[in-house]
């Protein structure tokens, strides 16, 4: 996240941390029914582990926390690697999450976002760009969905209705590292952090990220047919 | 089949220009990064440039940086290197190679170069 | 820039033999190195990604571990077709680079 701020603590108990050996955070995710995951379909790895109700990026113990295994992943069937339509993916946990203050479900929206929405995004990606800089602690954003027209006009011949855009000022957008994660709009889930342009936080050049209205019934289906 | 095949190298004297070309075919161009690597006679390899797959980030070794352009044409599939104020020290066998780490997508997790072209040869010398 | 060093520069050894290169960053680039495989008069060939990933298609007698600093690509049983030159690259800052190079040749 560019030009973020600290999270308060325990307010994104939705939060997860996708982590490949040893501790290296290469994704976010998002906790969407007590044992499953939504993230993006780009984040998609054999072995991974994860982790919810942890604040810092460090592999610091917090009492809060839970660990996990990914133990299957469903990526959506109209996603193509290295197109980035239809970015979104389903895991299912080892066991069902212990629900408590630090690690809770979000409810995914099936209302599509209209312009001017005021939304949080929130990761632990890299706070500079094109350089490398992580965060100590979970970042948060306010960014605001812009129209599928400036969208457009902003990314020509590569945005569809499964994407939608949001930004902020110059210098503020969400970056490596966050992929997966959560935008968060009027209390739901209405996004994930997909794409955008490189180096993040550009003029004009917004973060792109997959319109979950699109997807609820696909996501309702594939949690109750591997459930 | 997935294939780079690079051209216009050659012999050229030292403060002249090139400009070497690479065709790419079996795969989707627009959506990968590219690189141009060069390789001493004798020596280790050497990166010389990389452009994004939509050509908004570009970058240089500090040793061709205000000498050397790097471009793209996807409509084309086609990658480009503009060498100005060429220098003995350029003699190489130059390789265009595709990034397979796709820097617009916001994981934080990266690759390497997966598919080489077979080089062209440039010369600099009077 | 971050530098890349390689060791040994070149090492003799025979078929079946197990092989040990190291590479050694100059800064932590936590698992992002790529390994590769250069035979003479032809372009390089990704063998390893992320520090320990084989690319398609490459024998299982490659491997590769670390993160950091401190990398190593072993071939567990030299075979005839594995006497080449192997780079190590940093793949995550601009400017990327490449480590010197280990010749491994035939003993």
């Known amino acids: 996240i560019i030009n973020g701020s600290d999270c308060d603590m325990h307010t994104q108990p939705w939060q997860a941390a996708l982590l490949l050996r040893p501790n290296q955070l290469y994704c976010g995710a998002v906790l969407v029914h007590p044992q499953w995951l939504l993230t993006a379909a780009h984040c998609r790895k054999k072995v991974f582990r994860v982790r919810l109700g942890h604040y810092s990026l460090s592999p610091v113990y917090e009492s809060g926390q839970q660990m996990f295994q990914g133990v299957k992943s469903i990526p959506h069937p109209g996603y193509s690697h290295p197109g980035h339509s239809n970015d979104l993916m389903l895991i299912k946990l080892n066991r069902r999450i212990r629900p408590t203050k630090d690690v809770r479900p979000i409810n995914v929206s099936s209302h599509c976002p209209s312009a001017g929405t005021k939304c949080l995004v929130s990761g632990w990606g890299t706070t500079k760009s094109p350089q490398v800089h992580f965060p100590k602690v979970l970042q948060c954003l306010n960014i605001s969905v812009l129209s599928q027209k400036r969208c457009e006009d902003a990314y020509p011949r590569q945005i569809d209705d499964t994407m939608f855009c949001a930004g902020d000022k110059a210098g503020r957008d969400s970056c490596q590292g966050d992929s997966g994660g959560p935008v968060v709009c009027n209390g739901s889930l209405q996004g994930l952090v997909s794409w955008g342009d490189y180096p993040c936080a550009r003029p004009n050049r917004p973060g792109v990220y997959t319109n979950l209205c699109k997807f609820t019934k696909w996501i309702q289906e594939t949690i109750q047919a591997n459930s | 089949e997935v294939q780079l095949v690079e051209s216009g190298g050659g012999l050229v004297q030292p403060g002249g220009s090139l400009r070497l070309s690479c065709a790419a075919s079996g795969f989707t161009f627009e959506h990968y990064s590219m690189n141009w690597v060069r390789q001493a006679p004798g020596k280790g390899l050497e990166w010389v440039s990389y452009i994004s797959s939509s050509s908004s980030y570009i970058d240089y070794a500090d040793s061709v940086k205000g000498r050397f352009t790097i471009s793209r044409d996807n409509a084309k599939n086609s990658l480009y290197l503009q060498m100005n104020s060429l220098r003995a020290e350029d003699t190489a066998v130059y390789y265009c190679a595709r990034d397979l780490t796709d820097r617009q997508s916001r994981d934080y997790y990266y690759y390497g170069m997966d598919v080489w072209g077979q080089g062209t040869t440039v010369t600099v010398s009077s | 820039d971050i530098q890349m060093t390689q060791s040994p520069s070149s090492v003799s050894a025979s078929v079946g033999d197990r092989v040990t290169i190291t590479c050694r960053a100059s800064q932590g680039i936590s698992s992002w190195l790529a390994w590769y495989q250069q035979k003479p008069g032809k372009a390089p060939k990704l063998l390893i990604y992320a520090a320990s990933s084989l690319q398609s298609g490459v024998p299982s007698r490659f491997s590769g571990s670390g993160s950091g600093t401190d990398f190593t690509l072993t071939i567990s049983s030299l075979q005839p077709e594995d006497f080449a030159t192997y780079y190590c690259?940093?793949?995550?800052?601009?400017?990327?680079?490449f480590g010197g190079g280990t010749k491994v040749e035939i003993k």
């Open positions: 690259q940093q793949v995550p800052i601009f400017p990327y680079t």
